[in-house]
C-alpha cells in the first residue's frame, strides 16, 4: 500500500520519478516496461502458442468503459481466459497507453530502443490461485498481461469498437457501456510469436508480479483513431478548473540487468518482400 | 415463450433486508444479462444494477453499491437482488429485465410483472 | 450522471391530436430509447435506437433527434395511446430513465 494517499502522475512533481517515494515496488526489483533488444533475447522452444478462451464476447452483454484518471479502461469478464500457461489466468481488464498528436510514440515496451506510437494491455489474473485481480496482484504468478504494439497505418474497425466510445468517457470518473464483441480481433497476426519475461504493473503500486506476453507483431490503427485517443480525453474531473490532457501515458523503459526475455520464435524475421519468390 | 418472473416482495421494517428473486424461462439463460429496475410509487423508473449469469460478474448503480447485492443460481435460472439497511425511500416495485442488442443498439425487450416491496413499520 | 428531463411531465389530449414529448439529456448521448406503461404494468420497449420502433408498435409512432435533445411522436393519438412514456439513455453509467410523460384523455 502507498505510504500516503494515491495521487501519481505521468507529468510534473507526482510523475515516475516521484512514484517510489509513495510506492516502493517502483523503485523495486523486475520493474516494467523495457527495451527489447537482441542482447537479452533468448529463444525458448517450450513458448508454445497461448489459446484465448471466451474472448468472443457477446453484443448482447454490457462492459463497463471507464477514464480512471490514467488511462481509459475496458472491464472484461471473469469467463475470458488464457489457456496455456502454468495456471488458468481470468481476464480482468484491459487499457491502453500513448504518446501525443505531436509526438505519437507513447508505447511502454520498446523494440530496440524505439517506441511504437501506442500499447494495449490486456490484463488477467491467477484464478486458480486467487479469488480476483485486486488479491492476486500482489501475489507471485498473481497476474498475466498481454501487450499488444500498436502502430500508424490502416484504419483498425476492431479498435474502433472501443474508440468510438471515448467521447462518453471524456473525464476522470466517467463510465460507459461498450457492446461485448471478440477481443481477439484486438490481437496481431501470428500471436504463436511474442516475448515472455517477468516483470512488473507498469502504474504505481508496480507490483513485481506480471507474467509479460509482449506479441512480436504489431497491429494498426490509422492516423485519426490515434488522433482521437490522443485527444480525447482528461485526466481530470469535469468540474476540474484546471483540465489536464491524458497524453503521454507510459512509463520509461527500465533497468533490466543479467536478466532475459524469452522469444517463441528465433530471431530471424522471414523476408517476404514483394519480388523474392 | 420468454418470461422473467419476479418474487419475493411484501413488508420490511426499516433498517431490513429483502431477497428478491428473477426467474427465467423461454430461453438461453447465460445469453443475456439480468438487470433489476426499480420504480417508487407515482414515480419513475430508476436502475440498481445487473449480472451476467455466465460468470455471476456483477455492475452497480454506484448509488447503489455496499447496499445492493446481485447473485445468480445458474441452475435454477434465477437471478436475485439483496438489498440491506432499508428505508422508506426504498418502497418500490421493483422489476427485472433482459437487454437484446438489436441493430447497434440496446432495449429491455422484456420485463417482469414487478414484485412491491414496502418498508414501514 | 446524465440527467434526463422529459416534457411536458402530463399532457391532456384527444383522440387524433398530434402528440410530441420531448427528452433532453444533461450531456449529449449516442441514442435515445422509449418505453411505454400503463397502470399496474410492466414498462414496454417502444422505440430503440432513437427512431426504430419495436416490433408491433403501431407507424403513427416515431422518434427523432440526436445530441441532447430527442423526440417521440404520436401523428394522431388513439385511446390505446394513453399511457405514461419514459426516455432512456444507454451512453453512460449509470445508465438514467426520464421521469416520465403522462398522456391522459382530455
Known amino acids: 500500500a502507498p505510504v500516503n494517499g494515491s495521487k501519481w502522475t505521468y507529468f510534473g512533481p507526482d510523475g515516475e520519478n516521484s512514484w517510489s517515494k509513495k510506492y516502493p515496488s517502483c523503485g523495486g526489483l523486475l520493474q516494467s516496461p523495457i527495451d527489447l533488444h537482441s542482447d537479452i533475447l533468448q529463444y525458448d522452444a517450450s513458448l508454445t502458442p497461448l489459446e484465448f478462451q471466451g474472448y468472443n464476447l457477446s453484443a448482447n452483454k454490457q462492459f463497463l468503459l471507464t477514464n480512471n484518471g490514467h488511462s481509459v479502461k475496458l472491464n472484461l469478464p471473469s469467463d475470458m481466459h488464457i489457456q496455456g500457461l502454468q495456471s488458468r489466468y481470468s481476464a480482468t481488464q484491459l487499457h491502453l497507453h500513448w504518446g501525443n498528436p505531436n509526438d505519437p510514440h507513447g508505447s511502454e515496451h520498446t523494440v530496440s530502443g524505439q517506441h511504437f506510437a501506442a500499447e494495449l494491455h490486456i490484463v488477467h489474473y491467477n484464478s486458480d490461485l486467487y479469488p480476483d485481480a485486486s488479491t492476486a496482484s500482489n501475489k507471485s504468478e498473481g497476474l498475466a498481461v498481454l501487450a499488444v504494439l500498436i502502430e500508424m497505418g490502416s484504419f483498425n474497425p476492431s479498435y474502433d469498437k472501443i474508440f468510438s466510445h471515448l467521447q462518453h468517457v471524456k473525464y476522470k470518473g466517467q463510465e460507459a457501456f461498450v457492446p461485448g464483441f471478440n477481443i481477439e480481433e484486438l490481437l496481431p497476426e501470428r500471436t504463436a510469436e511474442y516475448y515472455r519475461y517477468r516483470g512488473s504493473l507498469t502504474t504505481p503500486p508496480c507490483n513485481p508480479t506480471v507474467l509479460w506476453t509482449v506479441f512480436r507483431n504489431p497491429v494498426q490503427i490509422s492516423q485519426e483513431q490515434l488522433l482521437a485517443l490522443e485527444t480525447a480525453l482528461y485526466c481530470t474531473h469535469m468540474d476540474d478548473p484546471s483540465p489536464r490532457e491524458m497524453i503521454n501515458n507510459f512509463r520509461q523503459v527500465q533497468k533490466f540487468d543479467e536478466r532475459l526475455v524469452y522469444t517463441s520464435f528465433s530471431q530471424v524475421q522471414v523476408c517476404t518482400a514483394a519480388g523474392l519468390s | 415463450e420468454v418470461q422473467l418472473v419476479e418474487s419475493g416482495g411484501g413488508l420490511v421494517q426499516p433498517g431490513g433486508s429483502l431477497r428478491l428473486s428473477c426467474a427465467a424461462s423461454?430461453?438461453?439463460?447465460?445469453?443475456?444479462?439480468i438487470y433489476w429496475v426499480r420504480q417508487a410509487p407515482g414515480k419513475g423508473l430508476e436502475w440498481v444494477g445487473y449480472?451476467?449469469?455466465?460468470?455471476?460478474?456483477?455492475t452497480y448503480n454506484q448509488k447503489f453499491k455496499g447496499r445492493a447485492t446481485i447473485s445468480v443460481d445458474k441452475s435454477k435460472n434465477t437471478a436475485y437482488l439483496q438489498m440491506n439497511s432499508l428505508r422508506a425511500e426504498d418502497t418500490a416495485v421493483y422489476y427485472c429485465?433482459?437487454?437484446?442488442?438489436?441493430?447497434?443498439?440496446?432495449?429491455?425487450?422484456?420485463w417482469g410483472q414487478g414484485t412491491l416491496v414496502t418498508v414501514s413499520s | 450522471d446524465i440527467q434526463m428531463t422529459q416534457s411536458p411531465s402530463s399532457l391532456s389530449a384527444s383522440v387524433g391530436d398530434r402528440v410530441t414529448i420531448t427528452c433532453r439529456a444533461s450531456?449529449?448521448?449516442?441514442?435515445m430509447h422509449w418505453y411505454q406503461q400503463k397502470p399496474g404494468k410492466a414498462p414496454k420497449p417502444w422505440i430503440y435506437?432513437?427512431?426504430r420502433l419495436v416490433s408491433g408498435v403501431p407507424s403513427r409512432f416515431s422518434g427523432s433527434g440526436s445530441g441532447t435533445d430527442f423526440t417521440l411522436t404520436i401523428s394522431s393519438l388513439q385511446p390505446e395511446d394513453f399511457a405514461t412514456y419514459y426516455c432512456?439513455?444507454?451512453?453512460?453509467?449509470?445508465?438514467?430513465f426520464g421521469q416520465g410523460t403522462k398522456v391522459e384523455i382530455k
Open positions: 429485465s433482459r437487454p437484446i442488442y438489436y441493430g447497434a443498439y440496446w432495449y429491455f425487450d422484456v
Open positions: 423461454g430461453y438461453s439463460y447465460t445469453d443475456y444479462n
Open positions: 449480472i451476467d449469469p455466465a460468470n455471476g460478474d456483477t
Open positions: 450531456s449529449s448521448v449516442t441514442y
Open positions: 435506437g432513437t427512431s
Open positions: 432512456q439513455q444507454w451512453s453512460s453509467n449509470p445508465l438514467t
